[in-house]
């Protein structure tokens, strides 16, 4: 194929992969009408004048997984086909100016994974129809203003993984076209007012794993078509009211990993597309009427691992399109019987690591779908008659590790496990704790005549009130979730990252699958 | 229908103590929230705390704390609230009431007038 | 505490007069407002709730409006029976708070 080098593979369709730890610089030669070239794994520690002059065609270049540490201006010279540029995870601390001029066709360049200490306006000036900028896993401490002012059609940004500790209101203003911005795992404290007023296309912004601890009232309100918006993982103690106020399209909010004690009246909303909502790892601990009543489409609410001592019986309205709902590793010790009436498409709620000592009788009542109840590492000691009976899609109920007082009252409970066995897995079964002759035994096989008998006085007869609501849209349903999967966060899908974390770990976590993504 | 039934009108001395009790029916009582709200003559409502019947678990308004103490019997379907050390000003009609489908006061029990007086 | 502040205190009107009364509160407390009417001797009654839904039962005259800090309560057609007081109250958070009231007398 017009000579293909001996440490090369050279296929039909003109592209040239040279591979292995005994190259040590550019091959030659190269086909002339190679397309499409890579050079991964290799020794290769300088790109020298010109190595890839006689092959002007070229449409992608990758030089990846080298030890390349210093590049010549002159290195790209010829390719003004150029449309694909990557130098991701070398060793790179400094760019020459005008390495990239010339490159006139080039729509993606990634600088991924070096040690670059520093970019300035020079570096992309010439790249003018770039839509692809990886800068992330660098050394980067600030961005020069003016950076990215020619990159005008830019479309996405990657800027995380470095050692940012400020950014200029500037930065990004003629950014117009750009989808996807993604400032994680930096040290950011805090992002001036203004940052983002001219990412008015802007789908995307990720701004986890920072130490944000305050957000400007007005920061997001030019972002109309926002998307996704991650801010887990930081220090953000309170949201003002106005924060997530201009965010119409947006679909998933992370904020899982921050220091929230309330959430503010309103905070939420008008939202109406959003789908998820992670709050996990806060220090929230009550939740008011009304909280999410603008996040009608709702489908994921994570609420697990806050200090929730209390939950208003009118918390959940408007959340018709719930499907999972996780209080897990809480403070929760009593819960309204009209608390969960309005979720009437719920499918997965996790209580457990809580300190209910009772549920209420008609707490499920309004919610038929349920199909998996998590309920281990609570307080309680019975359940109320017939609290489960009308639930025909359950088929994952966990009720160890509560303290079952198996004296006569028990009966109608035990023989309800009896015929539902399968339903309560089985790894773990609830055993009894009290009276002391039966404690450890399992509450399904237990022999209750000779537990002590109850002394408790019957329960009064109930009448069930007639519910009325006011009148609320009805939606269609969206997403079916039936795995129970556990993971430690939302999988932020990131084409360019690699070090997400999947967990099955089912005492800490409490949430599905469909959660991923 | 739901149904809060309060006890009769009470005259106590000041630095002597009330128990008002509210007998629920309707529902099943253990459930849901119950709440005290206080009215002085000619005044407005003032909101005391709650009790969940089902656990005994209270909160009380800060004002009250220490002075008031809210219990249940779930055998009788009653909710009792205690102020002790009264003082003039504690003259005020109290109602039980609660709440519906929110934290607001759906349901009420007529009132118990206390008079402190000496 | 959340201060609720209505208005008027007092105010004379006449069967089939349009009434407003408004509440402030000190903070954003949302949407959670109710609304309750009282009258000589009787214990109060839920009128409104998510500052805008009537209860179960309550004319279509009385209307709800309002969110943060600023609420209303309107009687478009004043009947013989709404001769009353007028409670507004918070529950965003404790101690859930009323406003002062607001009697509606005949003129």
């Known amino acids: 194929y017009h000579g293909c080098p001996s440490e090369c593979t050279c296929s039909r369709a003109s592209q040239v992969e040279c591979t292995g730890a005994r190259i040590v610089a550019v091959p030659t030669p190269l086909p002339w009408n190679a397309m499409s070239l890579q050079i991964l794994n290799t020794h290769i520690t300088e790109l020298n004048e010109s190595p890839f002059l006689n092959i002007s065609a070229l449409i992608a270049l990758r030089i990846e997984k080298n030890e390349l540490s210093r590049i010549t201006p002159g290195a790209f010279r010829n390719l003004g086909s150029l449309r694909y540029l990557s130098l991701a995870n070398n060793k790179l601390q400094v760019l020459p100016i005008g390495l990239f001029q010339g490159l006139d066709s080039l729509e993606s360049l990634l600088l991924s994974s070096n040690q670059l200490l520093q970019i300035q306006p020079a570096h992309f000036s010439q790249c003018s129809n770039l839509k692809e900028l990886q800068l992330h896993g660098n050394h980067l401490e600030y961005i020069p203003d003016g950076a990215f002012d020619h990159l005008v059609g830019l479309t996405k940004l990657n800027l995380g993984k470095n050692s940012l500790t400020h950014i200029s209101p500037r930065v990004f203003q003629h950014l117009g076209n750009l989808q996807v911005l993604r400032l994680y795992e930096n040290r950011l404290t805090d992002i001036p007012m203004g940052t983002f007023d001219g990412l008015v296309n802007l789908q995307e912004l990720a701004l986890q794993q920072n130490q944000i601890g305050l957000l400007s009232p007005g920061l997001f309100h030019n972002n109309h078509n926002l998307q996704r918006l991650y801010l887990s993982n930081n220090h953000i103690s309170q949201l003002p009211p106005s924060v997530f106020m201009q965010l119409p399209q947006l679909n998933r909010l992370t904020l899982f990993g921050n220091s929230l004690k309330e959430l503010s009246p309103g905070i939420f909303g008008p939202m109406p597309n959003l789908r998820e909502l992670w709050l996990y790892d806060n220090h929230i601990s009550s939740l008011p009427d009304n909280v999410f009543s603008n996040l009608r489409q709702l489908q994921v609410l994570i609420l697990s691992r806050n200090q929730i001592s209390f939950i208003s019986p009118g918390a959940f309205n408007g959340l018709t399109e719930l499907r999972e709902l996780s209080l897990h590793t809480n403070a929760l010790q009593d819960l309204d019987g009209n608390v969960f009436r309005m979720l009437a498409n719920l499918q997965n709620i996790s209580l457990q690591n809580n300190r209910l000592r009772q549920l209420p009788g008609n707490i499920f009542a309004n919610v038929n779908g349920l199909m998996a109840i998590q309920l281990q590492n609570n307080q309680l000691e019975n359940l109320p008659l017939g609290i489960f009976d009308h639930l025909g899609k359950l088929c994952e109920l966990r009720l160890y590790d509560n303290p079952w007082r198996c004296d006569s009252d028990i009966l109608p409970l035990r023989n309800w496990l009896l015929l539902n066995q399968p339903r309560l897995g089985t790894d773990t079964v609830p055993v009894c704790f009290s009276p002391a002759n039966v404690r450890g035994q399992s509450l399904i096989i237990i022999n209750v005549n000779v537990a002590v008998p109850s002394v408790h006085v019957p329960e009064v007869p109930s009448y069930p009130e007639t519910p009325w609501y006011p009148d609320t849209p009805s939606y269609p349903d969206t997403t079916s979730v039936s795995s129970t999967t556990e993971l430690t966060s939302p999988v932020e899908d990131y084409t360019d990252l690699t070090t997400i974390q999947v967990t099955d770990d089912r005492s800490v976590w409490g949430m599905t699958q469909a959660q991923s993504g | 229908q739901v149904q809060l039934v309060q006890s009769g009108a009470e005259v106590k001395k000041p630095g002597a103590s009330v128990k008002v009790s509210c007998k629920a029916s309707g529902y099943t009582f253990t459930d849901y929230y119950i709440n005290w709200v206080r009215q002085a003559p000619g005044q407005g409502l003032e909101w005391m705390g709650w009790i969940y019947p089902g656990s005994g678990n209270t909160k009380y308004a800060q004002k009250f704390q220490g002075r008031v103490t809210m219990t249940r019997d779930t055998s009788t379907s009653t909710v009792y609230m205690e102020l002790s050390s009264l003082r003039s000003e504690d003259t005020a009609v109290y109602y039980c009431?609660?709440?519906?489908?929110?934290?607001?006061?759906?349901?009420w029990g007529q009132g118990t007038l206390v008079t402190v007086s000496s | 505490d959340i201060q609720m502040t209505q208005s008027p205190s007092s105010l004379s009107a006449s069967v089939g007069d349009r009434v407003t009364i408004t509440c402030k509160a000190s903070q954003n407390v949302g949407i959670n407002v109710a609304w309750y009417q009282q009258k000589p001797g009787k214990a109060p009654k839920l009128l409104i709730y998510s500052a805008s839904y009537r209860s179960s039962g309550v004319p279509s005259r009385f209307s709800g409006s309002g969110s943060g800090t600023d609420f209303t309560l309107t009687i478009s057609s004043l009947q013989p029976e709404d001769f009353a007081t007028y409670y507004c109250q918070q529950y965003q958070s404790f101690p859930y708070t009323f406003g002062g009231g607001t009697k509606v007398e005949i003129k």
């Open positions: 009431a609660r709440w519906g489908y929110g934290a607001y006061f759906t349901y």
